[in-house]
């Protein structure tokens, strides 16, 4: 009869353990089951901001190719102009070729007419070599008309269809360059 | 709050090198650019190096070719590489990040001196 009770005993226990392993089981399911819907939460959130911001360029930016381009309302020195893109994530235009610039002017022409706008384009005090902001040199087609007579820096701007060069202190509009975003589709 | 934290400045004789380092962090938003700026005695704060967060990267004339800037996103870290330095690389240079809210934060500065 002791052991009748003993082998029951010993069921039960083994029960009461397979019982407490599929709540275990159970937690185990149930926490990677929150995990994967808090992921598929994040990651639709993620595809619907993604879906919202995927225009390649931000409003009221002009897109050629892999670039966009920002034409100012406003007028600024040269080094504040430097700022102003940056504040927008972008740098002052970087003319690479004579395509890039017959686009700049052709966009400007139907937008504002024949004004002056800053580029990333100064000439060194000492050397006087023009360079991009970056440190590249301009391309031979992509120099400055005319050098300016100043004794203060010297910086490249944008009128109808030629590059020249002034003051970088003087006032104009400026152009911001940042790079598209490349469509997922 | 957002802090920013930087390092690496010191006394380097002409010629020689040093490399500067900014960490963000905090309750910064996006970051769209990330520059470093310097202040001489008696002169105004000047942009030296700028990068974006696509990677496009502005410089002064007086540092194209002997400084370099570049960043780790993931970090939100930006490093100035100063070669070649001269005594008018004398400053405090300062840290300063545009954050895609629009807010703009500086650093407290370092200073880097350029002297046999």
């Known amino acids: 009869k002791l052991l009748q009770v003993s082998t029951i005993a010993m069921q039960q226990q083994e029960k009461l353990i397979q019982q407490e392993r599929a709540l275990l089981n159970f937690t185990e399911w149930k926490r990677s089951c929150a995990l994967q819907m808090k992921y598929c939460q994040a990651f639709m959130q993620n595809s619907l901001s993604s879906a919202h911001n995927s225009s390649p360029c931000p409003n009221n930016w002009i897109q050629n190719r892999e670039s966009c381009y920002y034409v100012s309302e406003i007028w600024s020195i040269w080094h504040t102009s430097q700022e102003n893109c940056l504040k927008e994530g972008s740098t002052l235009l970087q003319i690479e070729s004579k395509e890039e610039m017959d686009f700049i002017t052709g966009s400007l022409r139907k937008i504002k007419g024949s004004y002056d706008y800053w580029v990333g384009l100064s000439q060194d005090g000492h050397s006087g070599r023009w360079l991009w902001q970056d440190g590249s040199s301009p391309s031979p087609g992509l120099l400055p008309a005319e050098r300016s007579q100043s004794a203060n820096q010297v910086c490249g701007y944008v009128k109808s269809n030629s590059l020249l060069s002034s003051n970088c202190s003087t006032w104009k509009y400026f152009i911001c360059e940042k790079y598209a975003l490349r469509s997922s589709v | 709050q957002v802090q920013l934290q930087e390092s690496g400045g010191g006394l380097v004789q002409p010629g020689g090198s040093l490399r500067l380092s900014c960490a963000a962090s905090g309750s910064i938003s996006s970051i769209n650019a990330m520059g470093w700026y310097r202040q001489a005695p008696g002169k105004q704060r000047e942009l030296v190096a700028a990068?974006?967060?696509?990677?496009?990267?502005t410089y002064a004339d007086s540092v194209k070719g002997r400084f370099t800037i570049s960043r780790d996103g993931a970090k939100n870290t930006v490093y100035l590489q100063m070669n070649s330095l001269k005594p008018e690389d004398t400053a405090v240079y300062y840290c300063?990040?545009?954050?895609?809210?629009?807010?703009?934060?500086w650093g407290k500065g370092t200073q880097v001196t350029v002297s046999s």
């Open positions: 990068i974006t967060g696509q990677g496009r990267t």
């Open positions: 300063k990040v545009f954050a895609a809210d629009g807010m703009e934060y």
